[in-house]
């Protein structure tokens, strides 16, 4: 698996997740996230240079998972990526 | 690949394991499944776990399932335990990338009976 | 929940089939079609509705959107007769239909 990361945008709180997705070699198509305790997968949003975003009504629940499919129709999904109190600016690499 | 006995005594618990080739587990990127599919009938999903410990199970079976992950031997393993004629199936191990089965094992038939 | 119909088909080679599966709620386009032959693996043929996974003929194709999802096989091959699954993957439970069995006429 190519190495991947996610990096929490300023402007993320609450109710508002920013994430810069990379993959090496690749871009995104789609990404997805699943709050902590969730039984759904929900599309996130596509910005401007990378950055996806979800707004929710409710508080987000993390820890959160992330799946994706990209351009090159590469898919995957990672457990855990972004913890639940998370650090603006901060990068988090899948654990191996 | 799957292994494991394929007969198994009503009531005693049923263990399987499946071997990972091509790939580490470790790196991450997928779920680990296990589906199995009664004799003449459709395909059942048992549950999938994360390289982590992160699992999820068939609620109709959760009370009996355990599902592991040995990453330094690069397979997981599934164990069932208290188990009837009814649990009698083919079971499957997959590779879940988050949307589909991409990969699947070939199977192993388990048959419960005294 | 998703609903296969037919349960069954009786079909020729060369004949048009086309499966359906209904979702009990609305799941977009996140939808997957397996084919399952007695004593092998089963295989992906069409993930996210529509779109063929690499390898796969292209007498296979999906279709469908929201709660009605369709499998077709253009000129059914006699390799094609199986039983077929579709699968969501919209939830954490990755649920399937319970097939459709494609035999020969």
């Known amino acids: 698996v190519p190495k991947v990361t996610f990096t929490v945008e300023k402007g993320s709180n609450e109710k508002h997740l920013a994430v810069l997705v990379k993959y090496e070699g690749d871009t995104m198509a789609e990404v997805e996230l699943r709050e902590h305790g969730s039984d759904e997968w929900v599309a996130m949003t596509k910005g401007e240079g990378g950055v996806w975003t979800f707004d929710s009504e409710e508080p987000l629940q993390g820890p959160f998972n992330f799946r994706f499919l990209t351009e090159k129709g590469m898919k995957n999904v990672f457990d855990d990526v972004v913890p639940e109190k998370y650090t603006i600016g901060a990068t988090y690499a899948p654990e191996e | 690949l799957e292994s494991g006995p394929g007969l198994v005594k009503p009531a005693q618990t049923l263990s399987l394991s499946c071997a990972v080739s091509?790939?580490?587990?470790?790196?991450?990127?997928?779920?680990w499944s296990w589906i199995r599919q009664h004799p003449g009938k459709g395909l059942e999903w048992i549950g999938y776990i994360y390289h982590s410990g992160n699992t999820y199970y068939n609620p109709s079976l959760k009370s009996r399932i355990a599902m592991s992950v040995d990453t330094s031997e690069n397979k997981f393993s599934l164990r069932l335990n208290s188990v009837t004629a009814a649990d009698t199936a083919v079971y499957y191990c997959a590779r879940l990338d988050g949307y589909t089965l991409d990969i699947w094992g070939q199977g192993t038939l388990v048959t419960v009976s005294s | 929940e998703l609903t296969q119909s037919p349960s069954s088909l009786s079909a020729s080679v060369g004949d048009r089939v086309t499966i359906s599966c209904r979702a009990s709620?609305?799941?977009?386009?996140?939808l997957n079609w397996y084919q399952h032959k007695p004593g092998k693996a089963p295989k992906l043929l069409i993930y996210a509705a529509s779109s063929l996974q690499s390898g796969v003929p292209s007498r296979f194709s999906g279709s469908g959107y929201g709660t009605d999802f369709t499998l077709t096989i253009s000129s059914l091959q006699f390799e094609d007769f199986a039983s077929y699954y579709c699968q969501e993957s919209l939830s954490a439970s990755y649920t399937f239909g319970q097939g459709t069995k494609v035999e020969i006429k």
């Open positions: 091509g790939g580490s587990i470790r790196s991450g990127g997928y779920y």
């Open positions: 709620q609305r799941i977009n386009t996140y």
